[in-house]
């Protein structure tokens, strides 16, 4: 399975030597080192950390480690003019103000440069008006408000709870509904697990804790001022009015103590059903406006943040391949944090650091991988995946010709229950085989494999005896590699029990309380889950870089394509009359999927039988595997989303975090019954079926015998 070219370590010991070198104690030490001060993108502290990582990766033994800098649009609060929200009385007097900062956690009271909670890229403004509670501000929440309840958000300030979908989608939805401001808050129903104490006594969100985050709708563009191209020294920058994805209304986040004060006064309509109620002792009335006694009071936002072009720094390390140096396997994760980054990103960065150290140790002993491994510490992920996207834009020609795989390495943990993997179907078998070889860290699974505990705790909804592997969405640095460039990608981390913990993400996400102590005291005291994630991520990189034949199974793509085709067909069949009227047929898509399945099967047979000692044939077969993901890229991109070019997967138009299959068809069908011109709408469905069918067929043909 693994190559022994250019190595003095026997093949069967390659992977074992690499995995055995990974140590939990080192990950712990690295995490501590990375989390003592804030590392906000664009700050001196994060530049210094970049230089430290560059220096340490060199010491670990990488062939070269360079800084790649870009000048991108970032957003910061005004230090002398803080952001806040008030309740004002009829005379305009501020009778209540939200807090200006989170109470610092114990031991961090004297740390400087803790950025106060803010919504990055919010425009400035001081709107005042009546409040409307919009639940999670999802598409369906606004449908409920506008269509069923006949509540108009135009000219109102909306208050939405965090969770379920990416915050940028919430803001976009509010803008489209005509709101003039958005208040985001963390409801305990979503960010407070029952029976657990709040930080510092447990891992729950305290009432003064607030989630920071960007509110962009970039759709894969990277730096808002230089879409499609790197933000380098000679870049042409758009004016701010033409920038991609910026919100047009002020937005600000608050904690649940402050939210209580706003929501307890709400009047107007009662919530439509129990799914609109959180856990605060408030009526969750929708509004608009406050109840009886308080009906003359209004809400006023005071937002003074500024957008600034600022320099950011990626760290790019190279471990040159011995046999195929022009084939790149990339392991990347971000370095910038909102505050201390105890989980996001440094639990991931610490794992990457240890993986680099282990690879470096092997290299010092004379070993090299077959293919080149690139290691990346990305900057400005929190501001819209900017560091990774700018680097990929700068290196797109190399990447599209040489990129074998990208493994993402943000937060290693979001819980300590079981493994969570999202990846291309090409990597399913790699992940299955690898996890069968790794030991489970879980209590009650001593001596059992990771595959076994993962499958038991997170079973596949379709295939018994197999674990759940999810679709890639976005919201992290794999986006440009997978959705734009079509490089096979995957991510792995330890997660919570989704059955019992229905809160969104982890409670302290993007708050000041995301500290080293949070991880060391409550999530992973022995760092055994971090070590397991290091073994999974590192093991995937090792196999991708070192297997003689790339560990991709194209038959797994065939299986999911059929599943996705069935799903989108059943969605369309909710409109049987229109399908008949407008002659909508999925025959071409099912035919293409059938062809793909047959060709993939034959390719797999050839893959078993070909002469692996023939370097030309080996390279040819590997190239077919490498370029299969690329074959799903449509150079024209998806409608109105030119940087989302993958035809099989895209981030959901309603939730950036979620992956949608056959997104072009899905979006064309979405809410089609409300379209003013049904003929045009169904015409677009037909066009998207055509694009999908063509793409699947074209991808299948890349797997056919070359001549």
């Amino acid at each position: 399975k693994s190559s022994n070219e250019a190595t003095n370590i026997t093949p069967k010991h390659n992977m074992k030597a690499f995995l055995d070198e990974l140590k939990a104690e080192n990950i712990k030490k690295f995490l501590y080192n990375f989390t003592q001060i804030p590392h906000l993108a664009g700050t001196e502290q994060n530049f210094q950390l970049a230089k430290q990582i560059q220096s340490q990766w060199k010491e670990f033994g990488l062939d070269s480690v360079e800084l790649a800098h870009y000048d991108v649009l970032l957003s910061y609060p005004n230090k002398t003019h803080p952001n806040y929200i008030s309740i004002i009385n009829e005379d305009g007097n501020e009778i209540f103000n939200t807090s200006l900062f989170e109470p610092p956690p114990p031991g961090y009271e004297n740390v400087s440069d803790i950025v106060p909670p803010f919504s990055a890229f919010s425009p400035q403004g001081m709107p005042e008006g009546d409040l409307v509670y919009v639940n999670y501000a999802r598409t369906e929440d606004f449908f409920k408000l506008e269509r069923d309840m006949k509540i108009n958000c135009s000219g109102k300030i909306v208050i939405a709870r965090y969770g379920k979908v990416f915050r940028g989608n919430k803001v976009k939805n509010a803008q489209l509904a005509g709101a003039k401001g958005v208040i985001l808050y963390s409801d305990p129903a979503d960010y407070f697990a029952p029976g657990v104490k709040s930080y510092p006594d447990g891992w729950n969100l305290p009432g003064g804790g607030v989630q920071r985050g960007n509110i962009l709708n970039l759709n894969g563009a990277g730096d808002p001022l230089t879409p499609g191209y790197p933000a380098n020294e000679y870049a042409y920058r758009r004016g701010i009015a033409e920038a991609v994805g910026l919100p047009s209304i002020p937005v600000h986040p608050i904690g649940y103590y402050d939210a209580q004060k706003l929501l307890e006064k709400m009047g107007g309509s009662a919530p439509p059903d129990s799914s609109w109620r959180g856990s605060l002792k408030v009526p969750y009335n929708v509004g608009p406006g406050f109840t009886g006694n308080f009906s003359t009071q209004k809400v006023k936002m005071h937002i003074h943040s500024t957008n600034e072009v600022t320099r950011i720094y990626n760290v790019i390390g190279t471990l040159r391949g011995a046999v195929e140096p022009d084939r790149y396997v990339i392991l990347g994760g971000h370095r910038d944090s909102w505050v201390f980054g105890g989980i996001d990103p440094q639990s991931g960065a610490a794992v990457v650091h240890e993986i680099v150290r282990s690879f470096g140790t092997l290299k010092k002993e004379g070993w090299r991988p077959r293919r080149t491994i690139l290691f990346a510490s990305w900057d400005a992920e929190e501001f819209g995946l900017l560091g990774s996207t700018e680097w990929a834009e700068e290196n797109s020609r190399l990447l599209q010709e040489r990129g074998v795989a990208y493994i993402n390495a943000d937060s290693s943990i979001e819980g300590n229950y079981t493994l969570r993997v999202d990846c291309t179907p090409l990597m399913y078998s790699l992940v299955h085989n690898l996890t069968k070889e790794l030991k489970s860290p879980d209590e009650g699974f001593e001596g059992k494999s990771l595959y076994e505990s993962w499958t038991k705790k997170s079973p596949s909804p379709e295939f018994s005896g197999m674990p759940r592997i999810s679709k890639l969405g976005s919201g992290n640095d794999f986006e440009v590699f997978f959705q734009r460039l079509g490089i096979a990608s995957g991510r792995a981390r330890y997660t919570k029990n989704w059955e019992t913990n229905k809160f969104s993400g982890y409670p302290l996400y993007h708050s000041v309380y995301e500290t080293y102590e949070l991880v060391e005291k409550f999530y992973d005291p022995m760092f055994k889950y971090h070590l397991t994630v290091a073994q999974v991520r590192g093991g995937m990189v090792f196999e991708l870089a070192n297997s003689i034949v790339l560990p991709f199974d194209c038959r797994d793509y065939a299986v999911v394509l059929r599943k996705y085709a069935d799903k989108i067909y059943s969605i369309s069949m909710k409109h049987p009359q229109e399908m008949k009227t407008y002659s909508v047929s999925f025959d071409s898509l099912f035919s293409a999927v059938k062809n793909f399945t047959e060709i993939a099967s034959k390719f797999s047979e050839r893959l078993q039988d070909f002469d692996k000692s023939n370097p030309i044939v080996l390279r040819m077969m590997n190239d077919q595997l490498m370029f299969l993901e690329r074959a799903f890229i449509d150079p024209l991109g998806l409608p109105d989303r030119p940087f989302y070019r993958h035809v099989i997967y895209a981030p959901s138009s309603h939730n950036k975090y979620a992956g949608e299959s056959f997104p072009g068809i899905y979006d064309a069908l979405f809410d089609i019954e409300s379209k003013v011109d049904p003929s045009k709408a169904w015409g677009e469905v037909k066009r998207q079926i055509y694009v999908a069918a063509f793409t699947v067929q074209a991808a299948a043909e890349t797997l056919s015998e070359v001549a």
């Epitope: 305990p188 009432g207 109620r277 856990s279």
Partner: antibody
Framework: QVQLVQSGAEVKKPGASVKLSCKAS????????INWVRQTPEQGLEWMGG????????NYNENFKGRVTMTRDTSSSTAYMELSRLRSDDTAVYYC?????????????WGQGTTVTVSS | DVVMTQSPLSLPVTLGEPASISCRSS???????????LHWYQQKPGQSPRLLIY???NRFSGVPDRFSGSGSGTDFTLKISRVEAEDVGVYFC?????????FGQGTKLEIK
């Protein structure tokens, strides 16, 4: 740690007013409502009302409306309760208590109590 | 106003034995968000009341696990699995679902 320290005992004549104070420490004063509860052997514990230090909004028990006034001074983290037109049956121990907010929504911290005696 | 009725009003118990106090409300204490804001307070002789159990069954921090709460709707119970000498005092149930907040008359626990 959370602490509520109340002013000292008071002796008042019927018809007079009394103003009690409750100084809070160990937490962010504006986040938590302050309730006033009195205790008599006859009536047991009686909730008189509460104030939100953040915006000064008050919520009074109808039984005391017109006689009770609750205020706060955020600069000194102090809540006040004034009871006017005192009667002999207002003789009681008066407690301030912090409303615990989520997840409790119960009075999670109490002052030591102030004894008010109304006697001619 | 919501009337809270406790029974018994006096409860003599032998050390180490269990104790149970009942509390009934005149209307449902379920709030619109599904939570029930029924709490239990303990008042030791010469002291202020202190929170023991919140939202029916949740022990407040520092409260020994021999104390437990249960119930729903209008009927609630406080149990002490094994009474200790330090448990002597008056126990009040209270509701904060409806304004005005109201308390039970109190149950005096004493050692036999």
């Amino acid at each position: 740690q959370v602490q509520l320290v109340q002013s000292g005992a008071e002796v008042k004549k019927p018809g007079a007013s009394v103003k009690l104070s409750c100084k809070a420490s160990g937490y962010t004063f504006t986040y938590f409502d302050i309730n006033w509860v009195r205790q008599t052997p006859e009536q047991g514990l009686e909730w008189m009302g509460g104030i939100s230090p953040g915006d000064g909004n008050t919520n009074y028990n109808e039984n005391f409306k017109g006689r009770v006034t609750m205020t706060r001074d955020t600069s000194s983290s102090t809540a006040y309760m004034e009871l006017s037109r005192l009667r002999s049956d207002d003789t009681a121990v008066y407690y301030c208590a912090r409303d615990g907010n989520f997840p409790y929504y119960a009075m999670d911290s109490w002052g030591q109590g102030t004894t008010v005696t109304v006697s001619s | 106003d919501v009337v809270m009725t406790q029974s018994p009003l006096s409860l003599p118990v032998t050390l180490g034995e269990p104790a149970s106090i009942s509390c009934r409300s005149s209307q449902s204490l379920v709030y619109s968000n599904g939570n029930t804001y029924l709490h239990w307070y303990q008042q030791k002789p010469g002291q202020s009341p202190r929170l023991l159990i919140y939202k029916v069954s949740n022990r407040f921090s520092g409260v020994p696990d021999r104390f437990s709460g249960s119930g729903s709707g209008t009927d609630f119970t406080l149990k002490i699995s094994r009474v200790e000498a330090e448990d002597v005092g008056v126990y009040f149930c209270s509701q904060s679902t409806h304004v005005p907040y109201t308390f039970g008359q109190g149950t005096k626990l004493e050692i036999k």
